[in-house]
């Protein structure tokens, strides 16, 4: 016997989307009498967010479907439904089971820079020097493609002096020098970095941009003939 069932559904789906099916068996006759005819109902839902009727169950098949809009993994990632199965087509003996519905993540949250402005100091001529770590927050599921950040230098790097990579654990953007900077040629660079996710957004979301002012520090260089 099974008294706990699991199912899953993507956040943001439309009402009517099927989630899972639960089944209860009854050895009594279901052809000539109603003794073995099972009727299903949802007794309770936890949590009751955004309200207490997010799901419905088909009375005779036990198929659970979404009945309301508003499934949001970032607010409620999992629901627990108490299901009742009653024989005699709903007028007889009742047994209960639990259905756990996991709300799957969609990339419906953009990563956001926090902070959005940085100042850094870099000695001239240093190659592979870590300039700055950029921090983002993302409400999607941690360590998923919808959470992992992808950074792009959008402007300010005319000489292709900089590169940015994503730290695999912290999700920070690590800005480093690709080639040496020349204090005498340009002592300040203002970079504009945009962040998106590995996974595409499921809806149109504004992208976050950070500004990094990089001050190049003079290094005493030997005279050249």
């Amino acid at each position: 016997t099974q008294d706990t069932f699991r199912g899953s559904v993507l956040e943001g789906v439309l009402p009517g989307t099927s989630v899972m099916q639960v089944t209860a068996t009854d050895e009594d006759d279901a052809i000539y009498t109603y003794n073995g005819v099972v009727a299903y109902s949802i007794h309770s839902q936890e949590p009751k967010d955004p309200h207490d009727l997010m799901f419905t169950i088909h009375r005779s098949t036990g198929t659970i479907s979404v009945i309301s809009s508003g499934l949001d993994r970032e607010k409620v990632p999992e629901y627990t439904l108490t299901i009742q199965a009653t024989d005699m087509d709903g007028d007889g003996s009742t047994t209960t089971a639990v259905a756990v519905v996991e709300i799957l993540d969609a990339n419906d949250n953009a990563p956001m820079f926090d902070p959005q402005k940085y100042e850094a100091h870099v000695p001239e001529n240093a190659v592979g020097h870590e300039v700055q770590r950029l921090t983002v927050t993302d409400l999607d599921a941690p360590n998923s493609p919808a959470w992992r950040a992808t950074y792009l230098i959008m402007g300010g790097d005319d000489g292709d002096h900089f590169t940015i990579t994503t730290h695999p654990e912290s999700n920070q953007g690590i800005l480093t020098t690709r080639k040496g900077l020349d204090f005498e040629a340009k002592n300040q660079h203002t970079l504009y970095v945009e962040v998106t996710n590995e996974a595409p957004f499921v809806l149109k979301l504004p992208t976050s941009t950070a500004t990094i002012v990089v001050h190049v520090e003079d290094v005493n260089e030997a005279p050249v003939f």
Partner: antibody
Framework: QVQLQESGPGLVKPSETLSLTCTVS????????WSWFRQPAGKGLEWIGR???????NYNPSLKSRVTMSVDTSKNQFSLKLSSVTAADTAVYYC????????????WGQGTLVTVSS | DIVMTQSPDSLAVSLGERATINCKSS????????????LAWYQQKPGQPPKLLIY???TRESGVPDRFSGSGSGTDFTLTISSLQAEDVAVYYC?????????FGQGTKLEIK
């Protein structure tokens, strides 16, 4: 490295409310489930309930009528209140982080002993 | 609730020998949609919180020595320590997370013979 630390009174009188707070450091409280457990001396582990960073809760049905959990994301803390306590509620109480949205617990507090006695 | 039953309650094994702990669930914890068993194993030493060893029945948590392994599916699971070390003395718990009402086995106390 994520660290959790339970705090609260070690002694509670019968019929009163047990209140504990778990402070999370080294990581954000956002996008995770946070659970409370208890373990009477020499006994096994009992799950009390969990709260998501949004404030959404699930409680152990056997304790549901007495349990309230809350979260304060600005302080990176979550809390447990257990009302109408008796001597049977004497235990070491642990807070823990759920791994993803599963009921796997990868980070735990060191635990705090709460004794219910007059 | 899903009831978890461990056997034996206590176990004494010689250093370097194999230790085997069994866990049985009152219903299947295998989710057919992702073919994963929602079962974990924890180690708890005196005065310490539990430590996650194994999840999805057989996946070792990062940093856990490879002498620890998990196996099984459906309702029957096993934790094996291939060569017992002194630091492995502890109580071991299985836990199901198939249901939101998380439940643990009663624990198996592992000692050195």
């Amino acid at each position: 490295q994520v660290q959790l630390q339970e705090s609260g009174p070690g002694l509670v009188k019968p019929s009163e409310t047990l209140s504990l707070t778990c402070t999370v450091s080294g990581g954000s409280i956002s996008s995770y489930y946070w659970s409370w457990f208890r373990q009477p001396a020499g006994k096994g582990l009992e799950w009390i309930g969990r709260i998501y960073s949004s404030g959404s809760t699930n409680y152990n049905p056997s304790l549901k009528s007495r349990v309230t959990m809350s979260v304060d994301t600005s302080k990176n803390q979550f809390s447990l209140k257990l009302s109408s306590v008796t001597a049977a509620d004497t235990a070491v109480y642990y807070c823990a982080r759920g791994m993803g949205v599963t009921g796997l617990f990868d980070y735990w507090g060191q635990g705090t002993l709460v004794t219910v006695s007059s | 609730d899903i009831v978890m039953t461990q056997s034996p309650d206590s176990l004494a094994v010689s250093l370097g020998e194999r230790a085997t702990i069994n866990c049985k669930s009152s219903q299947s914890v295998l989710y057919s949609s992702n073919n994963k068993n929602y079962l974990a194993w924890y180690q708890q030493k005196p005065g310490q919180p539990p430590k996650l060893l194994i999840y999805w029945a057989s996946t070792r948590e990062s940093g856990v020595p490879d002498r620890f392994s998990g196996s099984g599916s459906g309702t029957d699971f096993t934790l094996t320590i291939s060569s017992l070390q002194a630091e492995d003395v502890a109580v071991y718990y299985c836990q199901q997370y198939y249901s939101t009402m998380y439940t643990f086995g009663q624990g198996t106390k592992l000692e050195i013979k």
